[in-house]
């Protein structure tokens, strides 16, 4: 397969899932750069900023589904993650503009990074699936960054409205990825304990 | 067991063009990022830049921009340092790296590729 | 770019005594927002690529014995080798991961007295 092997060490694989996770909540990896690249850095708008109720599964829920349906809504949710950050890449400012701005070409890269960091996560996702013997989850996508966008999820032609929209969305997802560390946290020594 | 298995040592003359590799094993090659690090006789570490198999997504230290090319193959798990023109100052150990997610810490290393570019 | 420096560059201690190397930033690598210190530490035997020792200024990798130890916040870090054993001699560096391109340290040698 593309993706190359998969480790058969439940221990190893969880701890990288969990350091995987512990880096990508926090936002000054990808909330801090998208506000200040699109110029939400101002504390009136930011508190605009919050995230949508239901765009995100809770903790409360996560900890209640079991490890193959925890497992499952994170890949079906990161799915969704990544069509929402190449839409919100489409419409970020080309570095040159960014340069002419005095805005930093580091924040643009961090946003850049984001989708091969979910990807890659979303892989250990597939791999712990795997070992958890879970037959009902799919290979992630192979597919990089040449592919078809998807259309933006929420159509406006209000520029602020969507900047407002990604911002929001993002707030959600870095809170989302605290949630999912804290239940891999709780995840036992061995594979075969509480499973559902 | 995770394993990063680099390309022999190489000996090239100036002007050369040379394509090291490093072959990941014992995890999914397509999980994590990989880092280029340089070592020059009795130097420090100087990090080159960093790709992300699964896409080709690709980052270079400015230091190293234009001076080489980091590419990779996910078919067979394998990342790639090259050089179109060696110069004698590229004369150093070369250490591919396992990044969890970019930027961070670096959690696996090859065992080194040394290069010597001599007359 | 970051610039990292340590000191001292080497230094000589007896075995079972304790070594202590710093690294100073050149701006804060402490993220507010979460309290974390976007540090690491590596330990390079002779002959061998580097190892990761301490990732987050003070979260001590799978494996790394308990005698090292690693410290600070903002743009000063310590890592502390609580009883050196014979096996420790090696150079050591510290490396932000605040932001790319990513620095190291330019290295402490630590060698038995």
């Known amino acids: 397969a593309a993706m190359g092997s998969c480790s058969k060490e439940y221990r190893m694989l969880l701890g990288q899932l969990q350091k995987q996770t512990d880096l990508m909540q926090d936002t000054s990896r990808l909330l801090d750069p998208y506000i200040r690249i699109q110029g939400l850095d101002i504390p009136k708008l930011r508190e605009h900023c919050r995230e949508s109720p239901g765009a995100f599964p809770s903790e409360e829920t996560l900890r209640g589904l079991g490890r193959r349906g925890f497992l499952q809504t994170l890949n079906a949710t990161l799915g969704r993650v990544l069509h929402r950050l190449a839409d919100l890449e489409q419409h970020l400012p080309k570095a040159q503009d960014l340069e002419r701005s005095g805005l930093n070409i580091e924040d643009l890269e961090k946003l850049q990074m984001a989708r091969p960091n979910v990807l890659g996560l979303r892989n250990n996702i597939y791999c712990m699936a795997q070992l958890l013997d879970n037959s009902d989850m799919t290979e992630p996508t192979k597919a990089g960054r040449g592919t078809p966008q998807p259309p933006t999820p929420t159509p406006t032609s209000d520029v602020f409205q969507r900047k407002l929209e990604g911002c929001s969305f993002l707030r959600g997802y870095h809170r989302f990825m605290h949630s999912v560390g804290r239940v891999f946290s709780k995840w036992g020594e061995s594979p075969n304990r509480s499973r559902r | 067991e995770v394993q990063l298995v680099q390309s022999g040592a190489e000996v090239k003359k100036p002007g050369e063009s040379l394509k090291i590799s490093c072959k990941g094993s014992g995890y999914s090659f397509t999980s994590y990022w990989i880092s280029w690090v340089r070592q020059m006789p009795g130097k420090g570490l100087e990090w080159m830049g960093i790709i992300y198999p699964g896409d080709s997504y690709t980052r270079y230290s400015p230091s190293f921009q234009g001076q080489v090319t980091i590419s990779a193959d996910k078919s067979i798990s394998t990342a790639y340092l090259q050089w179109s023109s060696l110069k004698a100052s590229d004369t150093a150990m070369y250490y591919c790296?396992?990044?969890?997610?970019?930027?961070?810490?670096?959690?696996?290393w090859g065992q080194g590729t040394l290069v010597t570019v001599s007359s | 770019d970051i610039v990292m420096t340590q000191s001292p560059d080497s230094l000589a201690v007896s075995l079972g005594e304790r070594a202590t190397i710093n690294c100073k930033s050149s701006q804060s690598v402490l993220y507010s927002s979460n309290n974390k210190n976007y540090l690491a530490w590596y330990q390079q035997k002779p002959g061998q690529p580097p190892k990761l020792l301490i990732y987050w200024a003070s979260t001590r990798e799978s494996g790394v014995p308990d005698r090292f130890s690693g410290s600070g916040s903002g743009t000063d870090f310590t890592l502390t080798i609580s009883s050196l054993q014979a096996e420790d001699v090696a150079v050591y560096y510290c490396?932000?991961?605040?932001?790319?391109?990513?620095?190291f340290g330019q290295g402490t040698k630590v060698e038995i007295k």
């Open positions: 790296a396992r990044v969890p997610v970019s930027p961070a810490y670096l959690d696996y």
């Open positions: 490396q932000q991961y605040y932001s790319t391109p990513l620095t």
